[in-house]
Interface confidence: medium
């Protein structure tokens, strides 16, 4: 058993038929020595008298808040949530495998620069009674501070017959230092509780494994007199890492046509304009990558032809 | 050429020669992300890899106020990456394909760091650690490990010679 | 035109509350970070809060600590400060200030709203 | 948290007069330090950012340098709109926190 936060205590059961269980001492959190009763949640039963109360927890009606009174007065409480193991693996109940870039991949987490800053977000069908706190820290035998907001709500969809919630936290790196090569990992660290079950997710990586840029911005095309051909051309996105002479990055110019079936002409360049053909009724699209280390390309900004 | 005195490196030649490295890093191992490395215990093997380090002058400021430090840093980096390299690590079994580009990526660092140190001049380089896996799959997995190292190694020096480059060159 | 206004400042008791809001113009809101400053009658300038771009992270002095809340509605180009609990020494005007994106020069705060004064008295 | 001391806390000097002003950080910050200028009842201007680079606008005659610790805020000729009280402020990590101020006036 261990405690969470004031008053929470997390208790890790090996999850198996006829499993033993733990037994569990609560304490009463008062100078009382006598007349002090325990209950369970809302139940009025009394489960036990004295300033300690001995149980064993083997199954989710074994958790939940135990509350020590005396004479009508509630003296303290202390909540009880399980974390599963079984077959020595804990349980993964609450979030949603999302399967990319691998299996087992709960957390998902992207940097739009080198500025320290990262957001992770998850996936789940459950939708009440579920709250989730996140800690971050640059390497893990000697952490560095990185600052988490609150883990919020950010997305609701429709999947066949379920409904899926994603959530989503912003992190800042302390003090981050865009220029050096990374050599020790972000940690991050989710603890979510649903009901009465605990469990903990953790992602670590480096900052430049997690970079994607937003698209160029102001994408524009110019006609070339007498010519099919146009000047296509686009700028930095304004959230990418500076000086652009520093951070740099290499773009990939796309000429799709309506169908999906057409082919594609597609053009790498280190530049920020390029001259291609363009066909009627196709668009014209730019991403970007960093130009020094393949992490991911942007989402494409697109223009059409006519 | 940057001489342990101080004088400037042949930033437009370094530069290009960086971007060569990137590229040829990243053909040698591609595959990011289909096997996270650090899940298998690296610290005995790239924790000695020198690491370009926040006060190590490599950032836009530090270039402006005096490059040498960040291109000695840069310098002691390519000279490692280039022992082992040529080391039984990469060398040994199993051979890798004749059409690899590991052996353009070693020729490559050594060039460049030519470029940055001419014959006659020394700067400090750093010790590489013995590292002379006995099995051939922990031979593949430090590899795959040193690429992946290397790849974040160039990155930051292919920045850092972009930006000389661009702002610094005379 | 580049700008930041402040309004919400006032007079309030000691213990009570006051919501302060910023309304920026001329430049996209949504990409910056932003800042709360106070400068307290005849003394320097105090940090106060900042928040993210997208308002998922906040930062706060000790000095405020679970007392102020700084939100932001980028729909409305507004930034906000939520005063709870104050203080005789909250007594200040309160500047919202924009931060500079370029990450080397940081948070840098390059532009400044026109303050707003907040007293607390009884 | 690391503190930020300015000095002198106020100094007097002719118009034409190099002016410097020191910025002391109890810790190293790099050359995340950003100069700001207030003038009396108005509303604080950035002057110089990352230590020496100057805010597009601002007259030449300021100027930053330092690095770690040690910074300086320098006016090459001193000119009578520069009369204001001058703030260092720090910026590597949260809190973000300015000098004490320096206080600038015409002999």
């Known amino acids: 058993i261990w405690e969470l936060k004031k008053d929470v205590y997390v208790v890790e059961l090996d999850w198996y038929p006829d499993a033993p269980g733990e037994m569990v001492v609560l304490t009463c959190d008062t100078p009382e020595e006598d007349g002090i009763t325990w209950t369970l949640d809302q139940s009025s039963e009394v489960l036990g008298s004295g300033k300690t109360l001995t149980i064993q927890v083997k199954e989710f009606g074994d958790a939940g808040q135990y509350t020590c009174h005396k004479g009508g007065e509630v003296l303290s409480h202390s909540l009880l949530l399980l974390h599963k193991k079984e077959d020595g693996i804990w349980s993964t109940d609450i979030l949603k495998d999302q399967k990319e870039p691998k299996n087992k991949t709960f957390l998902r987490c992207e940097a739009k620069n080198y500025s320290g800053r990262f957001t992770c977000w998850w996936l789940t069908t459950i939708s009440t009674d579920l709250t989730f706190s996140v800690k971050s820290s640059r390497g893990s035998s000697d952490p560095q501070g990185v600052t988490c907001g609150a883990a919020t709500l950010s997305a609701e969809r429709v999947r066949g017959d379920n409904k899926e919630y994603e959530y989503s936290v912003e992190c800042q790196e302390d003090s981050a230092c865009p220029a050096a090569e990374e050599s020790l990992p972000i940690e991050v660290m989710v603890d979510a509780v649903h009901k009465l079950k605990y469990e903990n997710y953790t992602s670590s990586f480096f900052i430049r494994d997690i970079i994607k840029p937003d698209p160029p911005k102001n994408l524009q095309l110019k006609p070339l007199k007498n010519s099919r051909q146009v000047e296509v051309s686009w700028e930095y996105p304004d959230t990418w890492s500076t000086p652009h002479s520093y951070f740099s990055l290499t773009f990939c110019v796309q000429v799709q046509g309506k169908s999906k079936r057409e082919k594609k002409d597609r053009v790498f360049t280190d530049k920020t304009s390029a001259t291609v053909i363009c066909r009627k009724n196709a668009s014209i699209s730019v991403r970007a990558q960093d130009r020094y280390y393949s992490s991911s390309w942007s989402e494409w900004a697109s223009v059409p032809c006519s | 050429r940057a001489v342990p005195g101080g004088s400037s490196p042949a930033w437009t030649q370094c530069q290009q020669l960086s971007q060569k490295l990137c590229t040829l890093a990243w053909s040698a191992h591609p595959l990011v992300g289909h096997m996270d490395l650090r899940e298998e215990g690296d610290e005995e093997t790239t924790n000695d890899v020198p690491h370009i380090q926040c006060g190590d002058g490599c950032d836009p400021q530090g270039l402006r106020d005096n490059s040498q430090f960040c291109l000695q840093r840069i310098h002691q980096g390519l000279i490692f990456y280039e022992k082992l390299l040529g080391s039984d690590i990469f060398t040994g079994e199993p051979s890798l394909l004749p059409d690899s580009p590991v052996g353009q990526l070693h020729a490559s660092l050594l060039g460049l760091s030519q470029l940055l140190q001419p014959e006659g001049h020394h700067w400090e380089t750093q010790q590489i650690p013995s590292l002379s896996p006995s099995q051939p799959w922990q031979r593949l997995l430090l590899r795959f490990k040193i690429l992946r190292s290397l790849q974040a190694f160039v990155a930051v020096a292919a920045r850092v010679f972009a930006h000389g480059a661009a702002t610094l060159s005379p | 035109e580049v700008q930041l206004l402040e309004s919400g400042g006032g007079l309030v008791q000691p213990g009570g509350s006051l919501r302060l809001s910023c309304a920026a113009s001329?430049?996209?809101?949504?990409?910056?970070?932003m800042d709360w400053v106070r400068q307290a009658p005849g003394k320097g300038l105090e940090w106060v809060s900042s928040?993210?771009?997208?308002?998922?992270?906040?930062f706060y002095a000790d000095s405020v600590k679970g007392r102020f809340t700084i939100s932001r509605d980028n729909s409305k180009n507004t930034l906000y400060l939520q005063m709870n609990s104050l203080r005789a020494e909250d007594t200040a005007v309160y500047y919202c200030?924009?931060?500079?994106?370029?990450?080397?020069?940081?948070?840098?705060?390059?532009?400044w709203g026109q303050g707003t004064m907040v007293t607390v008295s009884s | 948290d690391i503190q930020m001391t300015q000095s002198p806390s106020s100094l007097s000097a002719s118009v034409g007069d190099r002016v410097t002003i020191t910025c002391r950080a109890s810790?190293?910050?790099?050359?995340?330090l950003a100069w700001y200028q207030q003038k009396p009842g108005k509303v604080p201007k950035l002057l110089i950012y990352?230590?020496?680079t100057v805010q597009s606008g601002v007259p030449s005659r300021f100027s930053g340098s330092g690095s770690g610790t040690d910074f300086t805020l320098t006016i090459s000729s001193l000119q009578p709109e520069d009369v204001a009280t001058y703030y260092c402020?720090?910026?590597?990590?949260?809190?973000?926190?300015f000098g004490q101020g320096t206080k600038v006036e015409i002999k």
């Open positions: 402020q720090k910026y590597n990590r949260v809190p973000w926190t």
């Open positions: 928040i993210s771009s997208s308002g998922g992270l906040t």
């Open positions: 001329g430049f996209t809101f949504s990409k910056y970070d």
């Open positions: 810790q190293g910050i790099s050359n995340y």
């Open positions: 990352g230590a020496s």
């Open positions: 200030a924009r931060h500079d994106y370029d990450f080397w020069s940081g948070h840098a705060f390059d532009i």
